[in-house]
Protein backbone atom coordinates (compact mmCIF):
# COMPACT_ATOMS: atom_id res chain seq x y z
CA UNK A 1 0.00 0.00 0.00
CA UNK A 2 1.37 3.47 -0.83
CA UNK A 3 2.19 5.22 2.43
CA UNK A 4 1.24 8.63 3.85
CA UNK A 5 -0.73 9.97 0.91
CA UNK A 6 -1.31 13.69 1.32
CA UNK A 7 -3.25 15.97 -0.95
CA UNK A 8 -3.35 19.74 -1.20
CA UNK A 9 -4.91 22.22 -3.57
CA UNK A 10 -2.79 24.97 -5.06
CA UNK A 11 -5.47 26.46 -7.29
CA UNK A 12 -9.19 26.33 -7.97
CA UNK A 13 -8.74 23.58 -10.56
CA UNK A 14 -5.81 21.48 -9.30
CA UNK A 15 -4.98 19.07 -6.51
CA UNK A 16 -1.41 17.95 -5.83
CA UNK A 17 -1.06 14.42 -4.50
CA UNK A 18 2.11 13.12 -2.83
CA UNK A 19 2.87 9.77 -1.24
CA UNK A 20 5.66 7.47 -0.17
CA UNK A 21 6.38 4.07 -1.69
CA UNK A 22 5.20 0.96 0.17
CA UNK A 23 7.59 -0.03 2.95
CA UNK A 24 7.73 -3.70 1.91
CA UNK A 25 6.55 -4.03 -1.68
CA UNK A 26 5.82 -7.38 -3.27
CA UNK A 27 8.41 -7.17 -6.01
CA UNK A 28 9.29 -3.99 -7.86
CA UNK A 29 6.78 -1.16 -7.99
CA UNK A 30 6.37 -0.48 -11.71
CA UNK A 31 3.73 2.25 -11.45
CA UNK A 32 0.94 3.76 -9.39
CA UNK A 33 -2.70 4.20 -10.30
CA UNK A 34 -4.54 7.29 -9.13
CA UNK A 35 -8.33 7.50 -9.45
CA UNK A 36 -10.45 10.46 -8.39
CA UNK A 37 -14.12 11.22 -8.14
CA UNK A 38 -16.07 14.33 -7.31
CA UNK A 39 -17.99 14.25 -4.03
CA UNK A 40 -21.47 15.72 -3.82
CA UNK A 41 -22.11 18.27 -1.12
CA UNK A 42 -23.97 16.90 1.87
CA UNK A 43 -27.70 16.89 1.12
CA UNK A 44 -28.25 18.56 4.50
CA UNK A 45 -26.72 21.72 3.09
CA UNK A 46 -29.52 21.99 0.55
CA UNK A 47 -32.21 21.59 3.19
CA UNK A 48 -31.03 23.69 6.12
CA UNK A 49 -32.00 27.33 6.46
CA UNK A 50 -28.74 29.14 7.19
CA UNK A 51 -30.65 32.37 7.84
CA UNK A 52 -31.90 30.91 11.11
CA UNK A 53 -30.52 32.65 14.16
CA UNK A 54 -27.69 30.72 15.77
CA UNK A 55 -27.19 28.38 12.80
CA UNK A 56 -23.54 28.68 11.81
CA UNK A 57 -22.51 28.52 8.19
CA UNK A 58 -20.98 25.14 7.35
CA UNK A 59 -17.20 25.06 7.61
CA UNK A 60 -15.77 24.05 4.27
CA UNK A 61 -12.09 24.78 3.71
CA UNK A 62 -9.90 23.80 0.82
CA UNK A 63 -6.80 21.69 1.33
CA UNK A 64 -4.02 24.15 2.23
CA UNK A 65 -0.66 24.13 0.43
CA UNK A 66 2.20 21.90 1.60
CA UNK A 67 4.62 23.04 4.22
CA UNK A 68 8.31 22.35 3.59
CA UNK A 69 9.60 18.84 4.25
CA UNK A 70 11.47 20.07 7.31
CA UNK A 71 8.51 21.84 8.85
CA UNK A 72 6.37 18.78 8.24
CA UNK A 73 8.83 16.59 10.04
CA UNK A 74 9.03 19.16 12.79
CA UNK A 75 5.25 19.25 13.15
CA UNK A 76 5.09 15.49 13.30
CA UNK A 77 7.64 15.30 16.10
CA UNK A 78 6.26 13.03 18.78
CA UNK A 79 7.63 14.94 21.76
CA UNK A 80 7.96 18.68 21.66
CA UNK A 81 8.02 21.28 24.38
CA UNK A 82 6.99 24.91 23.97
CA UNK A 83 10.49 25.84 22.81
CA UNK A 84 10.20 23.27 20.05
CA UNK A 85 13.78 22.11 20.58
CA UNK A 86 13.21 18.47 21.58
CA UNK A 87 13.80 15.46 19.40
CA UNK A 88 12.08 12.09 19.72
CA UNK A 89 13.48 9.62 22.22
CA UNK A 90 15.69 6.76 21.04
CA UNK A 91 13.74 3.59 20.38
CA UNK A 92 13.87 0.74 22.86
CA UNK A 93 14.62 -2.85 21.82
CA UNK A 94 10.98 -3.80 22.34
CA UNK A 95 9.82 -0.94 20.09
CA UNK A 96 12.21 -2.00 17.33
CA UNK A 97 11.01 -5.60 17.64
CA UNK A 98 7.36 -4.47 17.54
CA UNK A 99 7.97 -2.41 14.37
CA UNK A 100 9.60 -5.39 12.66
CA UNK A 101 6.57 -7.53 13.55
CA UNK A 102 4.21 -4.86 12.20
CA UNK A 103 6.20 -4.60 9.00
CA UNK A 104 6.13 -8.36 8.57
CA UNK A 105 2.38 -8.44 9.30
CA UNK A 106 1.70 -5.66 6.77
CA UNK A 107 3.56 -7.57 4.06
CA UNK A 108 1.73 -10.82 4.84
CA UNK A 109 -1.59 -8.99 5.02
CA UNK A 110 -1.04 -7.28 1.65
CA UNK A 111 -0.19 -10.63 0.08
CA UNK A 112 -3.43 -11.99 1.51
CA UNK A 113 -5.44 -9.11 0.11
CA UNK A 114 -3.82 -9.57 -3.30
CA UNK A 115 -4.51 -13.25 -3.53
CA UNK A 116 -7.87 -13.57 -1.84
CA UNK A 117 -9.80 -10.33 -2.00
CA UNK A 118 -8.93 -8.99 -5.44
CA UNK A 119 -9.22 -10.43 -8.95
CA UNK A 120 -6.23 -9.18 -10.99
CA UNK A 121 -6.85 -6.95 -14.01
CA UNK A 122 -6.30 -8.64 -17.35
CA UNK A 123 -4.93 -5.69 -19.35
CA UNK A 124 -3.87 -2.13 -18.87
CA UNK A 125 -3.92 0.52 -21.53
CA UNK A 126 -3.18 4.21 -21.72
CA UNK A 127 -3.30 7.04 -19.28
CA UNK A 128 -6.33 8.92 -20.60
CA UNK A 129 -8.87 10.75 -18.54
CA UNK A 130 -11.33 7.90 -18.94
CA UNK A 131 -10.59 4.40 -17.67
CA UNK A 132 -11.24 1.98 -20.57
CA UNK A 133 -10.40 -1.08 -18.49
CA UNK A 134 -12.85 -3.13 -16.50
CA UNK A 135 -12.33 -2.25 -12.83
CA UNK A 136 -11.07 -5.08 -10.66
CA UNK A 137 -14.04 -6.68 -8.99
CA UNK A 138 -13.98 -7.33 -5.28
CA UNK A 139 -14.86 -10.86 -4.34
CA UNK A 140 -17.57 -11.30 -1.77
CA UNK A 141 -16.13 -11.25 1.72
CA UNK A 142 -18.30 -14.24 2.41
CA UNK A 143 -15.77 -16.29 0.46
CA UNK A 144 -12.95 -15.60 2.84
CA UNK A 145 -14.41 -16.15 6.27
CA UNK A 146 -14.41 -13.53 9.01
CA UNK A 147 -11.87 -10.86 8.19
CA UNK A 148 -11.14 -7.97 10.50
CA UNK A 149 -9.33 -5.23 8.65
CA UNK A 150 -7.39 -2.75 10.75
CA UNK A 151 -4.77 -0.97 8.70
CA UNK A 152 -4.07 2.65 9.62
CA UNK A 153 -4.69 5.26 6.86
CA UNK A 154 -6.04 2.63 4.48
CA UNK A 155 -9.76 2.19 3.89
CA UNK A 156 -9.88 -1.29 2.46
CA UNK A 157 -13.68 -1.45 2.47
CA UNK A 158 -14.84 2.16 2.73
CA UNK A 159 -18.35 3.08 3.80
CA UNK A 160 -20.00 5.49 1.41
CA UNK A 161 -21.48 8.42 3.28
CA UNK A 162 -24.25 10.70 2.12
CA UNK A 163 -21.64 13.18 1.01
CA UNK A 164 -20.04 11.01 -1.63
CA UNK A 165 -21.32 10.29 -5.08
CA UNK A 166 -21.87 6.52 -5.24
CA UNK A 167 -19.78 5.02 -8.01
CA UNK A 168 -20.24 1.41 -9.01
CA UNK A 169 -17.03 -0.55 -9.66
CA UNK A 170 -18.02 -0.83 -13.34
CA UNK A 171 -18.33 2.93 -13.84
CA UNK A 172 -15.57 4.75 -15.67
CA UNK A 173 -13.66 7.12 -13.43
CA UNK A 174 -10.90 9.52 -14.37
CA UNK A 175 -7.49 8.04 -13.58
CA UNK A 176 -3.81 8.58 -14.14
CA UNK A 177 -0.97 6.08 -14.40
CA UNK A 178 2.11 7.40 -12.61
CA UNK A 179 5.54 5.95 -13.45
CA UNK A 180 8.85 6.64 -11.70
CA UNK A 181 7.57 9.23 -9.24
CA UNK A 182 5.56 9.56 -6.05
CA UNK A 183 3.47 12.61 -6.89
CA UNK A 184 0.81 13.75 -9.30
CA UNK A 185 -0.86 17.04 -10.19
CA UNK A 186 -4.53 16.38 -10.95
CA UNK A 187 -5.82 19.14 -13.23
CA UNK A 188 -9.09 20.20 -14.83
CA UNK A 189 -11.09 19.98 -11.60
CA UNK A 190 -14.10 22.05 -10.58
CA UNK A 191 -13.50 24.93 -8.18
CA UNK A 192 -14.19 24.53 -4.46
CA UNK A 193 -15.23 20.93 -4.89
CA UNK A 194 -14.39 17.94 -2.76
CA UNK A 195 -12.66 14.99 -4.43
CA UNK A 196 -12.03 11.49 -3.15
CA UNK A 197 -8.72 10.18 -4.42
CA UNK A 198 -7.75 6.52 -4.55
CA UNK A 199 -4.11 5.47 -4.83
CA UNK A 200 -2.74 2.01 -5.66
CA UNK A 201 0.78 0.69 -6.07
CA UNK A 202 1.25 -1.85 -8.87
CA UNK A 203 4.10 -4.28 -9.36
CA UNK A 204 3.30 -5.67 -12.77
CA UNK A 205 2.30 -3.85 -15.93
CA UNK A 206 1.24 -6.52 -18.39
CA UNK A 207 -0.33 -8.94 -19.08
CA UNK A 208 -1.86 -9.08 -15.59
CA UNK A 209 -1.73 -5.88 -13.57
CA UNK A 210 -1.29 -6.63 -9.88
CA UNK A 211 -2.04 -3.68 -7.62
CA UNK A 212 -2.28 -3.08 -3.92
CA UNK A 213 -5.33 -2.37 -1.88
CA UNK A 214 -6.19 1.32 -2.27
CA UNK A 215 -5.21 4.12 0.05
CA UNK A 216 -7.75 6.92 0.14
CA UNK A 217 -7.43 10.64 0.68
CA UNK A 218 -9.83 13.55 0.27
CA UNK A 219 -9.18 17.09 -0.86
CA UNK A 220 -11.10 20.18 -1.87
CA UNK A 221 -10.00 22.56 -4.60
CA UNK A 222 -9.59 26.25 -3.80
CA UNK A 223 -12.42 28.73 -4.32
CA UNK A 224 -12.74 30.62 -7.58
CA UNK A 225 -12.67 34.40 -7.22
CA UNK A 226 -15.93 36.04 -8.34
CA UNK A 227 -17.75 32.69 -8.66
CA UNK A 228 -20.18 33.76 -5.93
CA UNK A 229 -20.93 37.15 -7.45
CA UNK A 230 -24.46 37.80 -8.66
CA UNK A 231 -24.19 38.45 -12.38
CA UNK A 232 -26.71 40.57 -14.22
CA UNK A 233 -29.10 43.16 -12.93
CA UNK A 234 -31.19 43.08 -9.79
CA UNK A 235 -34.67 43.76 -11.16
CA UNK A 236 -37.79 44.84 -9.33
CA UNK A 237 -41.54 44.94 -9.78
CA UNK A 238 -43.84 47.09 -7.68
CA UNK A 239 -47.22 45.58 -6.80
CA UNK A 240 -50.30 46.78 -4.97
CA UNK A 241 -49.96 47.84 -1.31
CA UNK A 242 -46.36 48.92 -1.94
CA UNK A 243 -45.06 45.39 -2.25
CA UNK A 244 -41.76 45.35 -4.15
CA UNK A 245 -40.61 42.06 -5.68
CA UNK A 246 -36.81 41.98 -6.03
CA UNK A 247 -35.38 39.43 -8.45
CA UNK A 248 -31.86 38.35 -9.32
CA UNK A 249 -29.98 35.49 -10.96
CA UNK A 250 -28.30 32.81 -8.90
CA UNK A 251 -24.54 32.60 -9.57
CA UNK A 252 -24.11 30.00 -12.31
CA UNK A 253 -21.09 28.12 -10.94
CA UNK A 254 -20.80 29.03 -7.27
CA UNK A 255 -18.13 27.77 -4.88
CA UNK A 256 -19.90 24.62 -3.70
CA UNK A 257 -23.41 26.00 -3.42
CA UNK A 258 -25.16 29.20 -2.41
CA UNK A 259 -26.59 28.84 1.09
CA UNK A 260 -28.17 32.28 1.48
CA UNK A 261 -28.50 35.81 0.13
CA UNK A 262 -28.22 39.04 2.08
CA UNK A 263 -30.44 41.87 0.94
CA UNK A 264 -29.40 45.28 2.20
CA UNK A 265 -31.80 48.13 1.48
CA UNK A 266 -32.37 51.66 2.65
CA UNK A 267 -34.67 54.57 2.06
CA UNK A 268 -32.87 57.81 1.27
CA UNK A 269 -32.02 59.45 4.58
CA UNK A 270 -32.71 56.33 6.67
CA UNK A 271 -30.41 53.67 8.06
CA UNK A 272 -29.69 50.48 6.14
CA UNK A 273 -31.92 47.47 6.84
CA UNK A 274 -31.17 43.81 6.14
CA UNK A 275 -33.07 40.79 5.02
CA UNK A 276 -31.80 37.22 4.84
CA UNK A 277 -33.09 35.02 2.03
CA UNK A 278 -32.45 31.30 2.37
CA UNK A 279 -31.90 28.90 -0.52
CA UNK A 280 -35.46 27.60 -0.32
CA UNK A 281 -37.04 31.02 -0.13
CA UNK A 282 -35.03 32.21 -3.11
CA UNK A 283 -36.04 29.15 -5.11
CA UNK A 284 -39.72 29.79 -4.40
CA UNK A 285 -39.82 33.28 -5.89
CA UNK A 286 -36.34 33.85 -7.45
CA UNK A 287 -35.80 36.66 -5.01
CA UNK A 288 -37.79 38.24 -2.19
CA UNK A 289 -40.57 40.70 -1.49
CA UNK A 290 -40.37 43.93 0.45
CA UNK A 291 -43.78 44.77 1.91
CA UNK A 292 -45.42 47.93 3.16
CA UNK A 293 -42.52 50.25 2.41
CA UNK A 294 -42.89 53.91 3.35
CA UNK A 295 -42.93 56.28 0.38
CA UNK A 296 -39.56 57.45 -0.90
CA UNK A 297 -36.45 56.58 -2.89
CA UNK A 298 -34.82 53.24 -2.09
CA UNK A 299 -31.52 51.60 -2.94
CA UNK A 300 -30.92 47.85 -2.71
CA UNK A 301 -27.75 45.76 -2.77
CA UNK A 302 -27.56 41.98 -2.67
CA UNK A 303 -24.79 39.48 -2.12
CA UNK A 304 -24.64 35.71 -2.12
CA UNK A 305 -22.98 33.56 0.52
CA UNK A 306 -21.61 30.18 -0.58
CA UNK A 307 -19.77 27.40 1.22
CA UNK A 308 -16.59 29.40 0.62
CA UNK A 309 -17.90 32.68 2.03
CA UNK A 310 -19.40 35.89 0.71
CA UNK A 311 -19.55 37.07 -2.86
CA UNK A 312 -19.39 40.74 -3.76
CA UNK A 313 -22.29 43.14 -3.24
CA UNK A 314 -24.17 43.98 -6.43
CA UNK A 315 -24.22 47.54 -7.70
CA UNK A 316 -27.14 49.37 -6.03
CA UNK A 317 -30.55 49.13 -7.68
CA UNK A 318 -32.89 52.08 -7.18
CA UNK A 319 -36.67 52.27 -7.04
CA UNK A 320 -39.29 54.73 -5.90
CA UNK A 321 -42.27 53.89 -3.71
CA UNK A 322 -45.23 56.22 -4.12
CA UNK A 323 -47.44 57.44 -1.30
CA UNK A 324 -49.86 54.82 -0.03
CA UNK A 325 -52.22 54.93 2.93
CA UNK A 326 -51.79 52.58 5.91
CA UNK A 327 -48.13 51.71 5.38
CA UNK A 328 -46.24 50.40 8.40
CA UNK A 329 -42.53 50.39 7.52
CA UNK A 330 -41.89 46.74 6.90
CA UNK A 331 -40.45 44.07 4.81
CA UNK A 332 -41.84 40.90 3.30
CA UNK A 333 -39.95 37.73 2.76
Amino acid sequence: VPLDPISVSNSSSQIILKWKPPSDPNGNITHYLVFWERQAEDSELFELDYCLKGLKLPSRTWSPPFESEDSQKHNQSEYEDSAGECCSCPKTDSQILKELEESSFRKTFEDYLHNVVFVPRKTSSGTGAEDPRPSRKRRSLGDVGNVTVAVPTVAAFPNTSSTSVPTSPEEHRPFEKVVNKESLVISGLRHFTGYRIELQACNQDTPEERCSVAAYVSARTMPEAKADDIVGPVTHEIFENNVVHLMWQEPKEPNGLIVLYEVSYRRYGDEELHLCVSRKHFALERGCRLRGLSPGNYSVRIRATSLAGNGSWTEPTYFYVTDYLDVPSNIAK
Partner: antibody, heavy 118, light 112 residues
Protein backbone atom coordinates in the same frame (compact mmCIF):
# COMPACT_ATOMS: atom_id res chain seq x y z
CA UNK B 1 -59.01 41.99 -6.81
CA UNK B 2 -57.08 38.81 -5.93
CA UNK B 3 -59.26 35.70 -6.21
CA UNK B 4 -58.51 32.02 -5.64
CA UNK B 5 -61.18 29.42 -6.38
CA UNK B 6 -60.69 25.74 -5.49
CA UNK B 7 -62.59 22.88 -7.16
CA UNK B 8 -62.35 19.09 -7.35
CA UNK B 9 -63.25 18.04 -3.83
CA UNK B 10 -65.64 15.21 -3.09
CA UNK B 11 -66.18 11.90 -1.35
CA UNK B 12 -63.67 9.18 -2.19
CA UNK B 13 -62.78 5.73 -0.86
CA UNK B 14 -59.48 5.05 0.92
CA UNK B 15 -56.69 4.22 -1.51
CA UNK B 16 -58.30 6.14 -4.36
CA UNK B 17 -57.19 9.39 -6.01
CA UNK B 18 -58.50 12.91 -6.41
CA UNK B 19 -57.24 16.01 -8.19
CA UNK B 20 -57.88 19.47 -6.83
CA UNK B 21 -57.61 22.68 -8.88
CA UNK B 22 -57.23 26.30 -7.86
CA UNK B 23 -58.00 29.01 -10.42
CA UNK B 24 -56.20 32.29 -9.73
CA UNK B 25 -57.05 35.78 -10.95
CA UNK B 26 -56.38 39.42 -10.10
CA UNK B 27 -52.58 39.10 -9.83
CA UNK B 28 -49.55 37.95 -11.80
CA UNK B 29 -49.87 34.25 -11.01
CA UNK B 30 -46.51 33.32 -12.57
CA UNK B 31 -44.68 35.63 -10.13
CA UNK B 32 -45.88 33.91 -6.98
CA UNK B 33 -45.18 30.64 -5.24
CA UNK B 34 -48.43 28.91 -4.22
CA UNK B 35 -49.42 26.66 -1.31
CA UNK B 36 -52.01 24.10 -0.33
CA UNK B 37 -53.14 24.22 3.30
CA UNK B 38 -55.76 21.91 4.83
CA UNK B 39 -58.07 21.93 7.81
CA UNK B 40 -59.50 18.70 9.20
CA UNK B 41 -63.06 18.93 10.60
CA UNK B 42 -63.04 20.91 13.84
CA UNK B 43 -59.24 21.04 13.78
CA UNK B 44 -56.46 23.51 13.12
CA UNK B 45 -54.66 24.41 9.92
CA UNK B 46 -51.91 22.24 8.43
CA UNK B 47 -49.54 23.22 5.65
CA UNK B 48 -49.53 20.59 2.87
CA UNK B 49 -47.30 21.67 -0.01
CA UNK B 50 -45.72 24.60 -1.84
CA UNK B 51 -44.63 25.10 -5.43
CA UNK B 52 -42.26 27.80 -6.70
CA UNK B 53 -43.29 30.49 -9.18
CA UNK B 54 -42.02 28.46 -12.15
CA UNK B 55 -43.00 25.02 -10.87
CA UNK B 56 -39.40 23.79 -10.68
CA UNK B 57 -39.24 23.57 -6.88
CA UNK B 58 -41.76 21.66 -4.77
CA UNK B 59 -41.85 20.88 -1.06
CA UNK B 60 -44.26 18.71 0.91
CA UNK B 61 -45.33 18.04 4.47
CA UNK B 62 -44.06 14.67 5.72
CA UNK B 63 -47.65 13.46 6.12
CA UNK B 64 -48.31 13.63 2.35
CA UNK B 65 -44.84 13.07 0.89
CA UNK B 66 -44.86 10.42 -1.81
CA UNK B 67 -48.67 10.48 -2.13
CA UNK B 68 -49.51 14.05 -3.11
CA UNK B 69 -48.11 16.02 -6.03
CA UNK B 70 -48.38 19.77 -6.40
CA UNK B 71 -48.16 21.30 -9.88
CA UNK B 72 -49.14 24.42 -11.76
CA UNK B 73 -49.95 25.65 -15.25
CA UNK B 74 -48.94 29.30 -15.50
CA UNK B 75 -50.53 29.65 -18.92
CA UNK B 76 -53.89 28.77 -17.33
CA UNK B 77 -53.27 30.56 -14.00
CA UNK B 78 -54.10 27.29 -12.26
CA UNK B 79 -52.62 25.38 -9.32
CA UNK B 80 -53.20 21.62 -8.85
CA UNK B 81 -52.95 19.02 -6.12
CA UNK B 82 -52.95 15.39 -7.23
CA UNK B 83 -53.82 13.23 -4.23
CA UNK B 84 -53.12 9.50 -4.48
CA UNK B 85 -53.47 6.66 -1.96
CA UNK B 86 -55.92 8.72 0.07
CA UNK B 87 -56.44 7.91 3.74
CA UNK B 88 -59.18 8.73 6.21
CA UNK B 89 -56.86 11.24 7.89
CA UNK B 90 -56.68 13.23 4.63
CA UNK B 91 -60.31 14.24 5.15
CA UNK B 92 -60.26 18.04 5.33
CA UNK B 93 -61.12 21.31 3.67
CA UNK B 94 -58.27 22.08 1.26
CA UNK B 95 -57.31 25.71 0.66
CA UNK B 96 -54.96 27.15 -1.91
CA UNK B 97 -53.09 30.21 -0.68
CA UNK B 98 -50.73 32.75 -2.17
CA UNK B 99 -47.17 32.68 -0.92
CA UNK B 100 -45.73 35.20 1.46
CA UNK B 101 -43.58 32.81 3.39
CA UNK B 102 -42.46 34.71 6.47
CA UNK B 103 -45.84 36.38 6.60
CA UNK B 104 -47.90 33.28 6.20
CA UNK B 105 -50.34 33.46 3.35
CA UNK B 106 -51.79 36.78 2.25
CA UNK B 107 -54.72 35.46 0.16
CA UNK B 108 -56.74 32.25 0.51
CA UNK B 109 -59.36 30.51 -1.58
CA UNK B 110 -62.75 29.56 -0.15
CA UNK B 111 -61.70 25.90 0.16
CA UNK B 112 -62.91 22.58 -1.24
CA UNK B 113 -63.93 19.64 0.93
CA UNK B 114 -62.34 16.21 0.55
CA UNK B 115 -63.93 13.30 2.43
CA UNK B 116 -62.13 9.95 2.47
CA UNK B 117 -64.52 7.28 3.65
CA UNK B 118 -65.40 3.69 2.84
CA UNK C 1 -41.33 21.30 13.68
CA UNK C 2 -41.89 24.32 15.90
CA UNK C 3 -44.97 23.85 18.09
CA UNK C 4 -47.35 26.79 18.51
CA UNK C 5 -49.55 26.71 21.61
CA UNK C 6 -52.55 29.01 21.90
CA UNK C 7 -54.62 29.92 24.94
CA UNK C 8 -57.40 30.04 25.82
CA UNK C 9 -59.11 27.45 23.64
CA UNK C 10 -62.38 29.32 23.95
CA UNK C 11 -62.91 33.00 24.74
CA UNK C 12 -66.43 34.28 25.59
CA UNK C 13 -66.45 38.10 25.48
CA UNK C 14 -69.09 40.77 25.99
CA UNK C 15 -69.61 43.11 23.04
CA UNK C 16 -67.57 46.27 23.41
CA UNK C 17 -65.16 44.65 25.88
CA UNK C 18 -61.48 43.90 25.18
CA UNK C 19 -60.18 40.43 24.34
CA UNK C 20 -56.70 38.98 24.50
CA UNK C 21 -55.35 35.77 22.92
CA UNK C 22 -51.94 34.30 23.79
CA UNK C 23 -49.60 32.31 21.54
CA UNK C 24 -46.41 30.61 22.65
CA UNK C 25 -43.79 29.02 20.38
CA UNK C 26 -41.51 26.13 21.32
CA UNK C 27 -38.49 28.06 19.98
CA UNK C 28 -37.62 31.72 19.56
CA UNK C 29 -39.09 33.09 16.34
CA UNK C 30 -36.35 35.68 15.78
CA UNK C 31 -34.87 35.04 12.33
CA UNK C 32 -31.21 35.60 11.48
CA UNK C 33 -31.98 38.99 9.95
CA UNK C 34 -33.59 40.18 13.17
CA UNK C 35 -37.18 39.91 11.93
CA UNK C 36 -39.78 37.88 13.82
CA UNK C 37 -42.18 36.10 11.52
CA UNK C 38 -45.30 35.66 13.62
CA UNK C 39 -48.73 36.11 12.01
CA UNK C 40 -52.34 36.15 13.18
CA UNK C 41 -55.28 34.88 11.13
CA UNK C 42 -59.01 35.23 11.62
CA UNK C 43 -61.46 32.61 10.40
CA UNK C 44 -65.08 33.61 10.57
CA UNK C 45 -67.70 30.80 10.65
CA UNK C 46 -67.95 29.10 7.24
CA UNK C 47 -65.21 31.26 5.73
CA UNK C 48 -61.57 30.81 4.79
CA UNK C 49 -58.79 32.28 6.94
CA UNK C 50 -57.82 35.93 6.53
CA UNK C 51 -54.52 37.40 7.69
CA UNK C 52 -54.84 40.20 10.23
CA UNK C 53 -51.31 40.76 11.48
CA UNK C 54 -47.86 39.95 10.07
CA UNK C 55 -44.44 40.20 11.67
CA UNK C 56 -45.87 40.36 15.20
CA UNK C 57 -47.47 43.79 15.06
CA UNK C 58 -48.09 44.93 11.47
CA UNK C 59 -51.73 45.15 10.45
CA UNK C 60 -52.76 44.11 6.96
CA UNK C 61 -54.55 46.75 4.91
CA UNK C 62 -58.26 46.80 5.62
CA UNK C 63 -57.87 45.40 9.13
CA UNK C 64 -59.56 47.62 11.77
CA UNK C 65 -57.21 49.33 14.19
CA UNK C 66 -58.93 47.70 17.16
CA UNK C 67 -56.74 44.67 16.34
CA UNK C 68 -53.14 44.83 17.55
CA UNK C 69 -50.32 42.36 17.91
CA UNK C 70 -47.38 42.35 20.31
CA UNK C 71 -44.71 40.12 21.79
CA UNK C 72 -41.20 38.88 21.11
CA UNK C 73 -39.09 35.73 21.18
CA UNK C 74 -41.56 32.99 22.13
CA UNK C 75 -44.50 34.91 23.68
CA UNK C 76 -47.04 36.73 21.53
CA UNK C 77 -50.45 38.33 22.03
CA UNK C 78 -53.35 39.41 19.83
CA UNK C 79 -55.56 42.07 21.39
CA UNK C 80 -58.97 43.34 20.32
CA UNK C 81 -59.64 46.63 22.09
CA UNK C 82 -63.45 46.50 21.75
CA UNK C 83 -65.03 43.30 20.46
CA UNK C 84 -67.69 43.66 17.78
CA UNK C 85 -70.18 41.05 16.53
CA UNK C 86 -68.24 40.57 13.27
CA UNK C 87 -65.17 39.48 15.25
CA UNK C 88 -66.73 36.12 16.13
CA UNK C 89 -64.70 33.20 14.81
CA UNK C 90 -61.48 31.27 15.33
CA UNK C 91 -58.12 33.03 15.61
CA UNK C 92 -54.89 31.26 14.68
CA UNK C 93 -51.30 32.29 15.22
CA UNK C 94 -48.74 31.03 12.72
CA UNK C 95 -44.96 31.14 12.66
CA UNK C 96 -43.09 31.63 9.39
CA UNK C 97 -39.57 31.68 10.77
CA UNK C 98 -38.94 27.92 10.60
CA UNK C 99 -39.71 25.75 7.61
CA UNK C 100 -42.43 24.64 7.30
CA UNK C 101 -44.69 27.28 8.81
CA UNK C 102 -46.79 25.93 11.66
CA UNK C 103 -50.12 27.05 13.12
CA UNK C 104 -51.45 27.26 16.63
CA UNK C 105 -54.49 25.15 17.49
CA UNK C 106 -56.83 28.14 17.38
CA UNK C 107 -58.87 30.19 19.87
CA UNK C 108 -62.62 30.39 19.43
CA UNK C 109 -63.96 33.85 20.19
CA UNK C 110 -67.69 33.99 20.95
CA UNK C 111 -70.05 36.61 22.27
CA UNK C 112 -71.35 36.13 25.85
Amino acid sequence: EVQLVETGGGVVQPGRSLRLSCAASGFTFSSYAMHWVRQAPGKGLEWVAVISYSGSNKYYADSVKGRFTISRDNSKNTLYLQMNSLRAEDTAVYYCARHEWGFGFDYWGQGTTVTVSS
Amino acid sequence: DVVMTQSPLSLPVTLGQPASISCRSSQSLVYGDGNTYLNWFQQRPGQSPRRLIYKVSNRDSGVPDRFSGSGSGTEFTLKISRVEAEDVGVYFCMQGTYWPGTFGGGTKLEIK
